[in-house]
Interface confidence: medium
C-alpha cells in the first residue's frame, strides 16, 4: 500500500508532526467483510457469522450483559451467541458537541488500572482526536477488546484474538440495536503474550485509524456517523493496563 505522512493526512493543520502518532502508515482500506467461519466479537472460537452455514444462528445480544440491554431477542427469532463480553453500563448523556481543546492528554493517570476499564469521552469523539492505550499483554492471553460505545451500541469494537481456531486474528465490528453487524478481519497481529504494547486510535472524519507499537495496523470506516454520541471507551481482556488517555492533534 502507498504510504503517506501525517502531514499529508492532516495538511493545513498547523501540526505537521504531532506527538505520539506514527509518521506514516499504509493507506489501507477497511478490512474485508466477514467470511464463512468468521467468529463474532467476544464469541469464542467456532462461532460462525450470518450466512456462513445454513441454519447457523446470527449474532445476537450478549446474554447477561448489564445496562439497558441485558436480554436476548425474541425466542426463536434472533438466537444469540452462547457467550461474550457484557456491555458497559451507560454513562450520562453526551454533550452535543465534541469540542476538545488541542491540549491534553486527558484520561486515566499513569499506573495500573483495573480491567475492564471505562474511559469517558464526554463530548464524544471528533476528528483529530488521538486515544492512546498503554499496557502489557498477560501471559497466555486469549483476547483484548476496545469498545467505543454509544450507550449500549458499540460503534467500534477492536478485538485481537490470540487463539481463534489456532490462529491469531483481529476482528472489528459494530453493534447496533443489540446485534452485531458484518465483521472486518485483519490477519496482521502485532500483539505478543507477556509483552508491552501501545495502541493508538486516531479519529478521522470517515474512519478510525489504529496503530500498534507505532506502526499503522488498520482503519475502520465509521458505521455510527454521530461521532459526538460515542461517549465512552471500554477496555477489557487479558491485559495489565497502564494508562488510557486522549488528546487532540
Amino acid at each position: 500500500a502507498d504510504n503517506f505522512s501525517l502531514h499529508d493526512a492532516l495538511s493545513g493543520s498547523g501540526n505537521p508532526n504531532p506527538q505520539g502518532w506514527p509518521g506514516a502508515w499504509g493507506n489501507q482500506p477497511a478490512g474485508a467483510g466477514g467470511y464463512p467461519g468468521a467468529s463474532y466479537p467476544g464469541a469464542y472460537p467456532g462461532q460462525a457469522p450470518p450466512g456462513a452455514y445454513p441454519g447457523q444462528a446470527p449474532p445476537g445480544a450478549y446474554p447477561g450483559a448489564p445496562g439497558a440491554y441485558p436480554g436476548a431477542p425474541a425466542p426463536g427469532v434472533y438466537p444469540g451467541p452462547p457467550s461474550g463480553p457484557g456491555a458497559y453500563p451507560s454513562s450520562g448523556q453526551p454533550s452535543a458537541t465534541g469540542a476538545y481543546p488541542a491540549t491534553g492528554p486527558y484520561g486515566a493517570p499513569a499506573g495500573p488500572l483495573i480491567v475492564p476499564y471505562n474511559l469517558p469521552l464526554p463530548g464524544g469523539v471528533v476528528p483529530r482526536m488521538l486515544i492512546t492505550i498503554l499496557g502489557t499483554v498477560k501471559p497466555n492471553a486469549n483476547r483484548i477488546a476496545l469498545d467505543f460505545q454509544r450507550g449500549n451500541d458499540v460503534a467500534f469494537h477492536f478485538n485481537p484474538r490470540f487463539n481463534e481456531n489456532n490462529r491469531r486474528v483481529i476482528v472489528c465490528n459494530t453493534k447496533l440495536d443489540n446485534n452485531w453487524g458484518r465483521e472486518e478481519r485483519q490477519s496482521v497481529f502485532p500483539f505478543e503474550s507477556g509483552k508491552p504494547f501501545k495502541i493508538q486510535v486516531l479519529v478521522e472524519p470517515d474512519h478510525f485509524k489504529v496503530a500498534v507499537n507505532d506502526a499503522h495496523l488498520l482503519q475502520y470506516n465509521h458505521r455510527v456517523k454521530k461521532l459526538n454520541e460515542i461517549s465512552k471507551l471500554g477496555i477489557s481482556g487479558d491485559i495489565d493496563l497502564t494508562s488510557a488517555s486522549y488528546t487532540m492533534i
Epitope: A68, G71, S90, N221, K226
Partner: antibody, heavy 117, light 110 residues
C-alpha cells in the same frame, strides 16, 4: 405471547394534535429499541421515529422532525408518539414496531390517523 | 433518507421462482448494514421474512431466501404459491441511526 397494540388514532384537523400509544406485552420491554413506522393509504412503509431502550437516543425522519415526539414509559411497557402540527400527508396507518439491527421483528396491527378538514 | 429502489411489480406462475431486487447506496445497503425483507398482505401488518441479509425467522418457509452483493440486496421466492401474493419491502439500517425502506414490490401470482 409477544404483542404490540396501538391506540389513539382517529380523525383530526390539519394543524391539530394527536397522541398515539402502544402497549407491549410478552417481552422485557426495556431491553428493546422501539419504532413507529407509518403507511399512507395505498403507499409504502415509511420509518417515522425510533427510541432506545433507556430513552437516551431518539431519532426522527426528516418529514416529522420538530413536529412529532417519541417517548416511552418502561414501567408501563408503553411507547408513545405525540404528533403536533398535523398535515394531510401525515394520514396513514401508524405501526408500533420492535426493533433489532437485523430487522423489525414484532409489529402491531396499526392505528389509523386521518388528517382532514 | 431517500427510499431504497425496488421494482414496482413482479409476477410468476405457481411453482416458479422470482427474485426481487433492492438497490441502495454505500450509506445503507452497501455500508455494512444489514438488510431485512417484509411481506405484507392487504389489510395486514408487515411480517419479517428475512433478516441479516439472508436469515429466516423461525416459521418462515425455506422457499424464501435473501442475499446481498454490494449495494443491492435480493429476495428470492422459489416454488411460488398462491399465498405468496403480497407486497414485499426491503429495509436497511443507516449510519445516521435511521431506517430506510424500499418503495415496495407487488408480487402477482398468475
Amino acid at each position: 405471547e409477544v404483542q404490540l397494540v396501538e391506540s389513539g388514532g382517529g380523525l383530526v384537523k390539519p394543524g391539530g394534535s394527536l397522541r398515539l400509544s402502544c402497549a407491549a406485552s410478552g417481552f422485557t420491554f426495556s431491553n428493546y429499541n422501539m419504532n413507529w413506522v407509518r403507511q399512507a393509504p395505498g403507499k409504502g412503509l415509511e420509518w417515522v421515529s425510533s427510541i432506545y431502550g433507556s430513552s437516551r437516543y431518539i431519532y426522527y425522519a426528516d418529514s416529522v422532525k420538530g413536529r412529532f415526539t417519541i417517548s416511552r414509559d418502561n414501567a408501563k411497557n408503553s411507547l408513545y408518539l405525540q404528533m403536533n402540527s398535523l398535515r394531510a400527508e401525515d394520514t396513514a396507518v401508524y405501526y408500533c414496531v420492535r426493533s433489532s439491527y437485523g430487522g423489525m421483528d414484532v409489529w402491531g396491527r396499526g392505528t389509523l390517523v386521518t388528517v382532514s378538514s | 433518507q431517500s427510499a431504497l429502489t425496488q421494482p414496482a411489480s413482479v409476477s410468476g406462475s405457481p411453482g416458479q421462482s422470482i427474485t426481487i431486487s433492492c438497490t441502495g447506496t454505500s450509506s445503507d445497503v452497501g455500508g455494512s448494514y444489514n438488510v431485512a425483507w417484509y411481506q405484507q398482505h392487504p389489510g395486514k401488518a408487515p411480517k419479517l421474512m428475512i433478516y441479516y441479509d439472508s436469515y429466516r425467522p423461525s416459521g418462515v418457509s425455506n422457499r424464501f431466501s435473501g442475499s446481498k452483493s454490494g449495494n443491492t440486496a435480493s429476495l428470492t421466492i422459489s416454488g411460488l404459491q398462491a399465498e405468496d401474493e403480497a407486497d414485499y419491502y426491503c429495509s436497511s439500517y443507516t449510519g445516521y441511526s435511521t431506517r430506510v425502506f424500499g418503495g415496495g414490490t407487488k408480487l402477482e401470482i398468475k
